[in-house]
Interface confidence: low
């Protein structure tokens, strides 16, 4: 299953399959997730080691048993690949690293006014993988405001150095934020020239294209079909690059197919997995296991659940079958692709779905209406779980926020439905940033069921929580994916990085905002909060957040939206925006429904609604 815990001061011994430099443990974990054989990783921050060569070292590891012995190493961080972790699988990495220079091939330098602009330039350059920006206080005046666009053979820095007044980061192309746009066309009977960066075997051009999209240096590809004249080259997928970023020439060639990486697509990228099953095809590779199962779909599920399995063949040969079950061959290779593809066989083959980010149909857990005052504009995909709950009567308007917690589930505040319990009048918009982008053609979700907490009473602050079951499940994308829930009764975690988001009023007597706002707010103890609200009972099922001096808070229109906190690189839904005395007033923190206290209720309702478990635990 999915394991998300990180081990501090621990290093996995042995099992190395690759090593590289990464700026932090989260990026190292992402590289492990996308490496075909990596199950475990260990990362050495700069502070953990004197050896300059090993600083920022990211070590990717494999293990037949799925685990390795841990040795104590001060400062080291270790953890698991996020294969099998559904919507948490993403190649998108937004963080900016201050005081760090990520080294690589510098191929472009320009003057820009901010690190954000430098990141945008990298994202809009087809060859840029990462960048470094020298701030206005950099010690050498001639380098100030320099934006260096970089690449490397493996897509990760060739070295990382601690350097004052330098900020570094990665291209946001994997976040589907590139302005370049992409070529969706596939060109029949055409071969591209230029430099081959890798060669893999694939059953069709679409798998070849997806592999190209997630390969750090592939910009375009040529695929030789299973009827290509040279037998040894059949099903070969050549991943290619060029100095210019486009093919310098192409040759008409029967039974070849060419196309481009889709990494530069805006707003949507293909999933990093291949779900198609190929009848009459055998995939060869290293044997991991052989099991008897009923049907090719069960064989694929078995491969997906066995974390080391990369692809499979389900044999229908009479000697491989007994009763209704046949042999399911679970296989792997060094590069994650079959080592041989044979046609016209009695088998059906396919790939593990361990990297599919749709995951299962679950919500994600780990073991007065009130909007954002004093906030700033959010950017695309920053809060992909945020939804807008709108009511369409004569006109349509935004009333509340909400949080996507599963393909078909939204968590919000019960008071959003005060006086409006009819599910037909509600429209739920997900994957949006600007309310003004909503037109009559914008897709929205309708409500199948509103589940208000049984103990909630109108105009009382207690049990202000409601679940919405959507009529149809949503697909996950970089801009629309769920937030993980805390573990039941989570009281031990100390959250220091918490944010509230919403389109609500920017001042007490204001109006709904167009761009989704965000504000960083510290949590306040319940004792402190109770002192500020002596006329109300602050229960242990509430959590408070706010600045003593005020100025930043949720407000009208933010209700039902998320209070999220980042811990160990993972966002969790800690609170639901509920109520407060005015907005952003001095010594009047916002009050939020404490999600951890309602985990049993959430589990019960999401399970009983359609009779099967809806919860999935990444821990």
């Amino acid at each position: 299953g999915c394991l998300t815990q990180l081990y501090e001061n621990a290093f996995f011994r042995g099992g190395d399959v690759a090593s590289m430099y990464t700026p932090n443990a989260q990026y190292c974990q992402m590289r492990c997730t996308f490496h075909p054989r990596c199950l475990l990783f260990s990362f050495l921050p700069a502070s953990s080691i004197n050896d300059m060569e090993k600083r920022f070292g990211c070590f990717l590891k494999d293990s037949v048993t799925g685990t390795l012995p841990k040795v104590h190493r001060t400062g080291a961080v270790s953890g698991h690949s996020l294969k099998q972790c559904g919507h948490q699988i993403s190649a998108c990495h937004r963080d900016i690293y201050k005081g760090v220079d990520m080294r690589g091939v510098n191929f472009n330098v320009s003057k820009v006014s901010s690190v954000e602009e430098c990141q945008k330039r990298c994202t809009s350059n087809i060859r840029c993988q990462f960048f470094s920006y020298a701030t206005q206080t950099f010690h050498k005046a001639e380098y100030r405001n320099n934006c260096l666009l970089k690449y490397s053979p493996g897509g990760t820095p060739t070295a990382i150095k601690v350097l004052s007044n330098v900020e570094s980061g990665f291209s946001l192309k994997p976040c589907a934020l590139s302005e370049i746009g992409c070529h969706m066309n596939i060109f029949q009977h055409l071969a591209f020239s230029d430099v081959d960066v890798a060669r893999v075997l694939t059953p069709d051009a679409f798998v070849c294209r997806t592999i190209c999209t997630y390969h750090p240096n592939c910009l375009f590809f040529t695929f030789y079909t299973n009827v290509w004249k040279i037998e040894s080259q059949r099903n070969v997928c050549l991943l290619k690059t060029s100095e210019s970023g486009t093919p310098s020439s192409s040759t008409p060639q029967e039974n070849t197919i060419s196309g481009y990486s889709l990494l530069t697509c805006k707003r949507t990228l293909p999933e990093p997995c291949h779900s198609k099953i190929y009848p009459g095809v055998d995939f060869g590779g290293e044997e991991l296991n052989v099991t008897f199962v009923k049907g090719v779909n069960v064989c694929q599920e078995t491969c997906t659940k066995m974390i080391r399995c990369q692809f499979f063949t389900y044999s229908l040969l009479p000697e491989d079958c007994k009763e209704e079950k046949c042999k399911c061959f679970l296989r792997l290779s060094m590069d994650g692709s079959p080592t041989r593809i044979a046609y016209g066989t009695q088998g059906s083959s396919g790939y593990s779905l361990r990297l599919c980010n749709t995951g299962d149909n679950s919500v994600c857990t780990t073991k007065t209406s009130t909007r954002i005052v004093g906030g700033t504009n959010s950017s695309w995909g920053e809060w992909p779980w945020q939804v807008s709950l709108q009511v369409k009567l004569t006109a349509q308007r935004h009333l509340c926020g909400g949080s996507l917690i599963g393909h078909q589930w939204v968590l919000t505040a019960a008071h959003c439905f005060d006086g409006l319990p009819l599910q037909d009048v509600w429209r739920i918009y997900s994957g949006i940033l600007n309310l003004s982008d909503i037109t009559k053609d914008t897709p929205f979700s309708q409500i199948k069921e509103i589940i208000i907490h049984q103990n909630y009473k109108v105009s009382e602050g207690n049990h202000d929580i409601a679940l919405i079951k959507l009529q149809a499940p949503l697909n996950y994308t970089e801009f629309q994916k769920p937030i993980c829930l805390p573990s039941k009764g989570d009281t031990s975690t100390i959250y220091t990085n918490c944010w509230v988001t919403g389109w609500g009023f920017s001042k007490e007597k204001g109006e709904i905002q167009n761009i989704l706002q965000k504000v960083n707010i510290p949590l306040v103890t319940n004792e402190e909060c109770q002192k500020r609200y002596q006329d109300y009972k602050i229960t242990q099922r509430m959590v408070c957040a706010g600045y003593k001096e005020g100025g930043k808070d949720a407000c009208k229109g933010d209700s039902g939206g998320p209070l999220v906190c980042k811990h160990n690189g993972m966002w969790r839904l800690v609170g639901i925006t509920s109520w407060g005395e005015g907005c952003a007033r001095r010594e009047q923190p916002g009050v939020y429904t404490k999600v951890a206290e309602y985990m049993d209720w959430i589990l019960e309702k999401t399970q009983s609604s359609d009779g099967k478990a809806q919860m999935q635990s990444p821990a």
């Epitope: 969706m184 596939i186 059953p203 069709d204 051009a205 679409f206 695929f223 079909t225 299973n226 009827v227 039974n255 197919i257 779900s275 198609k276 099953i277 009848p279 009459g280 046609y343 016209g344 066989t345 009695q346």
Partner: antibody
Framework: EVQLLESGGGLVQPGGSLRLSCAAS????????MIWVRQAPGKGLEWVSS????????QYADSVKGRFTISRDNSKNTLYLQMNSLRAEDTAVYYC????????????WGQGTLVTVSS | DIQMTQSPSSLSSSVGDSATITCRAS??????LNWYQQKPGKAPKILIY???QLESGVPSRFSGSGSGTDFTLTVSGLQPEDFATYWC?????????FGQGTKLEIK
């Protein structure tokens, strides 16, 4: 130029048999998966059967399983469909088509041959 | 088996208009969706494969989009020769299945 030419259709009584042929030219026949698709008069398209390039793997629609047999002779560039125990509901135009297995679509079709099952 | 639901079953349009036909799969089929055109007494002809890829020789007024379960065929600027029956087909899994067809007629 790629060409597929079906033959062998005609009128047959229920319970009878027919053998359809599809002669291929203009491409390397032995490299391609081939399929039969049928279309009842005024109705939709229905996949009937597929055969791999070598002939080693065959697949059938549930409605014809056990009654129809697909085969090919790569030396003669010909695809066959042996139809036994024919029923009135098998009445249709039968098309052979070339299956681009790498991308999964039917890029060339024959002109079709009509099979009528009636007493 | 994967069911393919095509709509509408018939569509009346004029020369120069745009026409849109939709196809829905009973389960996700990624981009393995193909569109064919058929004229009376003739065999079907491939227009679009892989949901959005235009077969060579097919006019650019034909376009396809979609992935997963919902797909669309659009014909912009209808020409007299475009009035025919259109079929969608999934090639994600055998048995290949077709939609019920859409007859595009002249208004």
């Amino acid at each position: 130029e790629v060409q597929l030419l079906e033959s062998g259709g005609g009128l047959v009584q229920p319970g009878g048999s027919l053998r359809l042929s599809c002669a291929a030219s203009g491409f390397t026949f032995s490299f391609y998966k081939m399929i039969w698709v049928r279309q009842a008069p005024g109705k939709g398209l229905e996949w009937v059967s597929s055969i791999s390039s070598s002939g080693g793997s065959t697949q059938y629609a549930d409605s014809v399983k056990g009654r129809f047999t697909i085969s090919r002779d790569n030396s003669k560039n010909t695809l066959y469909l042996q139809m036994n125990s024919l029923r009135a509901e098998d009445t249709a135009v039968y098309y052979c088509a070339r299956d681009r297995v790498d991308l999964g679509y039917l890029d060339y079709w024959g002109q079709g041959t009509l099979v009528t099952v009636s007493s | 088996d994967i069911q393919m639901t095509q709509s509408p079953s018939s569509l009346s349009s004029s020369v120069g208009d745009s026409a849109t036909i939709t196809c829905r799969a009973s389960q996700s089929i990624s981009i393995y969706l193909n569109w064919y055109q058929q004229k009376p007494g003739k065999a079907p002809k491939i227009l679009i494969y892989g949901a959005s890829q235009l077969e060579s020789g097919v006019p650019s007024r034909f376009s396809g989009s979609g992935s997963g379960t919902d797909f669309t065929l659009t014909v912009s600027g209808l020409q007299p020769e475009d009035f025919a029956t259109y079929w969608c087909q999934q090639s994600y899994n055998v048995p290949y299945t077709f939609g019920q067809g859409t007859k595009l007629e002249i208004k």
